[in-house]
Every structure is written in C-alpha cells, then in structure tokens.
C-alpha cells in the first residue's frame, strides 16, 4: 500500500491521543534505553510503511502484535485516514485470524514495540532545523 495520500495530521492526532499511551502501557517496566534503534524511516509515508510492517507482520520471536490495543487503534487510524487502505488489508486480516495464538509478551516483542515507538516519534517530530 502507498501511504502517500494519507491524512498525516489526523493520524498524528490519533497517535498523540491514544496510540502513544497504549505503546507506553505495553512497554511498562522496560527502560527506554534498553533497546537500540534498529529501524528508521525517512519521511511520513515511509514511516507508515515501516510501522505497518512491524505492527502487523509476524517476525521471528514475536508471532503477532496485531491483537494488541495499540495495533487495533493503528489499524483503525490507517483505515480511516488512508484512502483505500481497508481494501488492501482484507486478505491479510483473514489470514491472521487463522494464525491466532495465545498472547505472550516476549523480549523480542518488547524490542519490536520499542522500535515502533521510535518510528512513531519520527513520524510525528517537527524538523527543528532545516540545515
């Protein structure tokens, strides 16, 4: 999906009002410096691409974050503020339902969510200096 035509300000507002808090809740008890940055993004569409990938694609050691509160709110924000996003996710959602497993918060998942926090911060940050 190409995130170029999303309403970035509306997504930013959704992040600031709820998603950020859910990410913090998930990471509670974890030091903010515990994980180094291993993923970055270079503009807002790129950030959303990487956020979608880390949030909804299973990875080794972290089978699925998609049922977490922050993930469901992320999905809702993208569905509302990114034209055509919902249609692209129907097949992925059906596949995900078949894979549903019990919820276990592994260290790998904590690391992944830490990376998500970093991506969201980059998505939202103002560029302080134009160089």
């Amino acid at each position: 999906y190409d995130f170029t035509n999303c309403d970035f300000e509306k997504i930013k507002a959704a992040y600031l009002s709820t998603i950020s808090k859910d990410l913090i809740t998930y990471m509670s008890g974890t030091k903010s410096t515990e994980f180094n940055n291993t993923v970055s993004c270079s503009n807002r569409p790129h950030c959303l691409t990487e956020i979608q990938s880390l949030t909804f694609n299973p990875t080794a050691g972290c089978a699925s974050l998609a049922k977490e509160m922050f993930a469901m709110k992320t999905k809702a924000a993208l569905a509302i503020w990114c034209p055509g996003y919902s249609e692209t996710q129907i097949n992925a959602t059906q596949a995900m339902k078949k894979r549903r497993k019990r919820k276990v918060t592994t260290n790998k998942c904590l690391e992944q969510v830490s990376q998500l926090q970093g991506l969201w911060r980059r998505f939202n940050r103002p560029l302080l200096k134009q160089q």
Partner: antibody, heavy 122, light 108 residues
Framework: QMQLVESGGGVVQPGRSLRLSCAAS????????MHWVRQAPGKGLEWVAV????????HYADSVKGRFTITRDNSKNTLNLQMNSLRAEDTAVYYC???????????????WGQGTMVTVSS | SYVLTQPPSVSVAPGQTARITCGGN??????VHWYQQKPGQAPVLVVY???DRPSWIPERFSGSNSGNTATLTISRGEAGDEADYYC???????????FGGGTKLTVL
C-alpha cells in the same frame, strides 16, 4: 548486535580500480542512509559519499566525484564503493557508517565499521 | 562550500571541564554532531543534534550550539577521554557532509 564490516581494501597502483564492500547486520539496513568516510594516515575525517535509504539518490565529495560510485543492495544488506582512477591521495582507512535521514537531510552517523585500509602506491 | 573550524588541541586537568569549539557561519541554524576517535579505532558518536546524547554515552558529555559556535563540553575529565574529537554537519545547500578538522584532547 548492530554491526558494519568493511572489506576489499588493499594495495593498488595509481590509475587502477578497487571495490570496497560493507556488510550490515543487526538492523533494518533498507531504512538507513549509508555513508563512506575516509581518513588518511595522521589526518582528520573526510566524508566521501552517501546513498539514500532506498538507493534512489547519491551525493559525493568533490574530491571523488566522477571517480567513485556508491551503491547498495538492500536485499543483501550490503553497501559498496567502486573506486576508479585511484590516486596516491586516496590512500586512507575507509569507514562505512549508517545514518538515519529525514527527507533530504542526513542525521548523525551512529554506527561505524572498523575500517579497511586502501593504499595507492606504485 | 561550508567550513567548520576547530582548535587543533585542547588540554584539561583530570576532574576539570574541557570545552571544544566548532566554528561555522551561522552554525546555530544547523544540527551539529560530535564524534570521539581514539587511536586505531573507528569514530564513536558522542553528541548528536547539538545536545542529544546516545544512550551509551555518559552524562559528562554535553553539547550546545548558537550563533557561529557549537561547543562540546566534557565535565570531570578522565584519562579515558583522551582522543580526537570531530564536529560534523549536513549542508543541505550543497548536499554534502562536512567535518571539522578535529581537536586532540589531552588530559594532563
């Protein structure tokens, strides 16, 4: 563990070519800008080139423009520097370094390789 | 092209504060990064975006930037701080990375 490992250095005659490589591991390579920086013996750091996270754009120092080419292969997590028409003044340790970027701005180089020595001598 | 000027050397007594400057035309409008390099080793980022510090760098390292001068401050200097220090910026007008000439810090 995040790591950059350079290879390909060696002794080469003036006018000849050399290709350096940098293998990345422990991070999502395709999301970072990547630089080459060199350091002549006993001298300071000199920036050489940078390639955008997706390989779409490159920028070069005037001293190497037209002679060096920076490329990346995101499927293999590798960065390359093709060095042609080498000169004695290209003798240096060559480092690769990663750098987050925002739009067209490259940020600090937060991870560096250990460097590979290139000696241009007849 | 943009030029960054650093003093070749700075000395500090153990436990005292060292300040390394980096001069450039209106450098305060740019983000400045600082690197430490010990002999035979690769550079290490110690301060980025003027004053931010990577999680692995001690709080003794700090930075500031305004006007025509950026400054790296190392408080409570230790023998292990002896190294070359380089400032760096990204010059958007020319799409180039610019490094300062480097400053050798000696802990007396």
């Amino acid at each position: 563990q995040m790591q950059l490992v350079e290879s390909g250095g060696g002794v080469v005659q003036p006018g000849r070519s050399l290709r350096l490589s940098c293998a990345a591991s422990g991070f999502t390579f395709r999301t970072y800008g990547m630089h080459w920086v060199r350091q002549a013996p006993g001298k300071g750091l000199e920036w050489v080139a940078v390639v955008w996270y997706d390989g779409s754009y490159t920028h070069y120092a005037d001293s190497v423009k037209g002679r060096f080419t920076i490329t990346r292969d995101n499927s293999k997590n590798t960065l390359n520097l093709q060095m042609n028409s080498l000169r004695a003044e290209d003798t240096a340790v060559y480092y690769c370094a990663r750098s987050p970027q925002w739009e067209e701005i490259f940020e600090a180089m937060d991870i560096w390789g250990q460097g590979t020595m290139v000696t241009v001598s007849s | 092209s943009y030029v960054l000027t650093q003093p070749p050397s700075v000395s500090v007594a153990p436990g005292q504060t060292a300040r390394i400057t980096c001069g450039g035309n209106n450098i305060g409008s740019k983000s400045v990064h600082w690197y430490q390099q010990k002999p035979g080793q690769a550079p290490v980022l110690v301060v980025y975006d003027d004053s931010d510090r990577p999680s692995w760098i001690p709080e003794r390292f700090s930075g500031s930037n305004s006007g025509n001068t950026a400054t790296l401050t190392i408080s409570r200097g230790e023998a292990g701080d002896e190294a070359d220090y380089y400032c760096q910026i990204w010059d958007s007008s020319s799409s180039l990375v610019v490094f300062g000439g480097g400053t050798k810090l000696t802990v007396l």
